[in-house]
Every structure is written in structure tokens, then in C-alpha cells.
Interface confidence: medium
């Protein structure tokens, strides 16, 4: 014999204060799967956390944090303060970047530094943990003949990356 | 959506081994360590180790050091807890948990482990 | 390794009434790696307070943490039915982590 509660499709909970008719989810709950005798309370997003995907009938909130903080943990059930600049998060808590990478942001990896010989330039302006390098002229722009020096070119625009 | 999935429960004869698996989805599970904690029945929580998936650093408590190996498959997103020689008191649900450097945060549903002959 | 007593095992309480749990440890542990986990019959274990005052996300703001030291408490300040629950106070300081024995709490 088949259970009637099978029936019930994601987004509702068989009732069996009403023989076990499939009633909606009551307002902030859900069911994300079908045949549920209840529906679970929406997680809600307070504080230090904010929400990022509301809840619906059939699916969770979803939470991340506050600027100037974030998430720790799968499904970021904790907030945390960034780290500094010329760090990154990593599962062991805020890192230095490793010698050759670098991070402008409080957030985000650590990514290398750019590598000016590869445009034919040189090192104008060495990188940090902070910063990355500043390309200067080629070396040929630099010789004691030439007629013009060539302006650094800009810092590539950093990356943003998600958490 | 963030999950671990436990393996099905297992019944086991006493001096046989048995192994769990956790696989991860939602996320990489080289980002977090994986811990496996157990729970006897009407009991509390015990930790056994944890395993950083991303180099395969292991840390075991002493009691369950030559009883419990940690493994992962990265290319599967997947943890394992491998016990050896299951007496009566080895039966428990036990859970794997993802964690950063200070707290366990999500758990898989559990697995159930019954030792008997 | 670091003994967490919990106190009481188990207690009732009314609804709407204030409720605090105890958490003692054999020595001293930082408060951020000092946590709680709720867990009901048939469910995993979730995360609840995290270093040691800190909501996790979707726990309501009736619920606080305090303590520093070996000394630490959970508090309910209206006791509702969903409350009904194991509480584990657990620490990370130090290898290897420990969990307390869990105080149940129960509905008068």
C-alpha cells in the first residue's frame, strides 16, 4: 500500500491533522524535498549576518555577513572580521601571502605578482605582500641611445574574488 | 545547497572492519578540514580525528590512534574513516563535520554502526 | 586533555521562562574556541554559539553565550518549545577537542 504522504510535493508537508492532505509550507518554513510530514523553519539572516537568498517554499535562506566581516565555515554559519591586506583566509585563519603574491583587499586570495618580463618590461617598482610590482620601461627604453622613456604602466586592476 | 552525505548504516560482526564515507558537495572540499566524531547510544560526542583534504595532514585522539584511519579522495569530494577491530563498544552513529582552524561547523547526517555477532 | 563538565544533565523548563546552562572546563580555554552545538533526537548536531558569545546563523536572539576562563554559559531568555534539545559546550584550545557531556533540557 502506497503512502499517501509520497505524494506530497517539495514546498508542502502532509497534514495528518487532515488526512494526510498535502498543505503548503505556513509562512517562513519550507520542505526542500517531496513526502515530508513537516516543514523545516527558515534559517533566518540577523546581526552580524545578512541574507543573500531568501527563503522560499521549497528552499533555505541563505546568509553571508556584514561588510567588514566573512564567512567561516560551509553554508557561513559563522562571521568573522576580514583580514588585513597582504593576507588571505585560509581554513587556518588569516595568512601572510606567500613571498611572490600579494592582496590590496581584506578579502580575497593572494594572487602573483605580475610578471613585467613577460611584456618585455622591467621592475619599477618592487611588489609587497601589499601591492603588486610596478612595471617600469623595457630594458632597450632604458639605454644610454634612447630617445624617449616609455610611462610605467599602470598596476593590473585587481581581481575580485569570491570567498 | 551545502551538504555532506554520510554512507548507509552498517551491521558488523565483532573483529571485522568497516568503512564510512562523507562526500561534500556545495563546496571544495579541500577548504575545510573534515573531522569525524562518534556518538554512542545515549551518549555524547567523541572526537576521533580530522583530515586536512588539501595535504593530508591527520591528527587523531589518542584513543582512537591505532583504531581509525582518515583517507580522502579530492577528485571525489569525498572523506573516509576507515575502523578496525569492531567490539560491542564501537557501535555509534558517527558523524563527519567540516571545520576551519577553531570550530566544527557542518555536520553530515550521521552514520550508524551496529557491532554484533 | 580538557574535561568539560556540563551542568545540569538534564532540566525542565516553562515556557516563557529564563533558562541557564553551565559549562565547566578542567582548565582554562580561550573563549573563541569555546562553542555550543544544539542537537535533537534523530538530528545531527548544529552549531549554535560559536566562540563563545556568537549566534550562529539562523539561531534566534533569544538565545546568549558568556563565559571566559574555565567558566561558561548558554542562556534561553524565554524558554519556547523548539528550544527542547540536548546542548553540548565543546573546546578546540587544545588537542586533542573535547565535548561536554550535554545538558538536556526538557519542557515542564
Known amino acids: 500500500l502506497q503512502d499517501p504522504c509520497s505524494n506530497c510535493p517539495a514546498g508542502t508537508f502532509c497534514d495528518n491533522n487532515r488526512n494526510q492532505i498535502c498543505s503548503p509550507c505556513p509562512p517562513n518554513s519550507f520542505s526542500s524535498a517531496g513526502g515530508q510530514r513537516t516543514c523545516d523553519i527558515c534559517r533566518q539572516c540577523k546581526g552580524v549576518f545578512r541574507t543573500r537568498k531568501e527563503c522560499s517554499s521549497t528552499s533555505n535562506a541563505e546568509c553571508d555577513c556584514t561588510p567588514g566581516f566573512h564567512c567561516l565555515g560551509a553554508g557561513c554559519s559563522m562571521c568573522e572580521q576580514d583580514c588585513k591586506q597582504g593576507q588571505e583566509l585560509t581554513k587556518k585563519g588569516c595568512k601572510d601571502c606567500c613571498f611572490g603574491t600579494f592582496n590590496d583587499q581584506k578579502r580575497g586570495i593572494c594572487r602573483p605578482w605580475t610578471n613585467c618580463s613577460l611584456d618585455g618590461k622591467s621592475v619599477l617598482v618592487n611588489g609587497t605582500k601589499e601591492r603588486d610590482v610596478v612595471c617600469g620601461p623595457s630594458p632597450a627604453d632604458l639605454s644610454p641611445g634612447a630617445s624617449s622613456v616609455t610611462p610605467p604602466a599602470p598596476a593590473r586592476e585587481p581581481g575580485h574574488s569570491p570567498q | 545547497e551545502v551538504q555532506l552525505q554520510q554512507s548507509g548504516a552498517e551491521l558488523v560482526r565483532p573483529g571485522a572492519s568497516v568503512k564510512l564515507s562523507c562526500t561534500a558537495s556545495?563546496?571544495?572540499?579541500?577548504?575545510?578540514?573534515i573531522h569525524w566524531v562518534n556518538q554512542r547510544p545515549e551518549q555524547g560526542l567523541e572526537w576521533i580525528g580530522r583530515i586536512d583534504p588539501e595535504d593530508g595532514d591527520i591528527a587523531y585522539a589518542p584513543k582512537f590512534q591505532d583504531k581509525a584511519t582518515l583517507t580522502v579522495d579530492t577528485s571525489s569530494n569525498t572523506a573516509y574513516l576507515h575502523i578496525i577491530g569492531l567490539t560491542s563498544e564501537d557501535t555509534a552513529v558517527y558523524y563527519c563535520t567540516t571545520g576551519n582552524y577553531y570550530a566544527m561547523d557542518f555536520w553530515g547526517q550521521g552514520t550508524s554502526v551496529t557491532v554484533s555477532s | 586533555q580538557i574535561v568539560l563538565t556540563q551542568s545540569p544533565a538534564i532540566m525542565s523548563a516553562s515556557l516563557g521562562e529564563r533558562v541557564t546552562m553551565t559549562c565547566t572546563a578542567s582548565s582554562s580555554v580561550s573563549s573563541s574556541y569555546l562553542h555550543w552545538y544544539q542537537q535533537k533526537p534523530g538530528s545531527s548536531p548544529k552549531l549554535w554559539i560559536y566562540?563563545?558569545?556568537n549566534l550562529a546563523s539562523g539561531v534566534p536572539a533569544r538565545f546568549s553565550g558568556s563565559g571566559s576562563g574555565t567558566s561558561y554559559s548558554l542562556t534561553i531568555s524565554s524558554m519556547e518549545a523548539e528550544d527542547a534539545a540536548t546542548y553540548y559546550c565543546?573546546?578546540?584550545?587544545?588537542?586533542?577537542?573535547?565535548f561536554g557531556s550535554g545538558t538536556k533540557l526538557e519542557i515542564k
Open positions: 565543546h573546546q578546540y584550545h587544545r588537542s586533542p577537542p573535547t
Open positions: 566562540s563563545t558569545s
Open positions: 556545495g563546496f571544495n572540499i579541500k577548504d575545510y578540514y
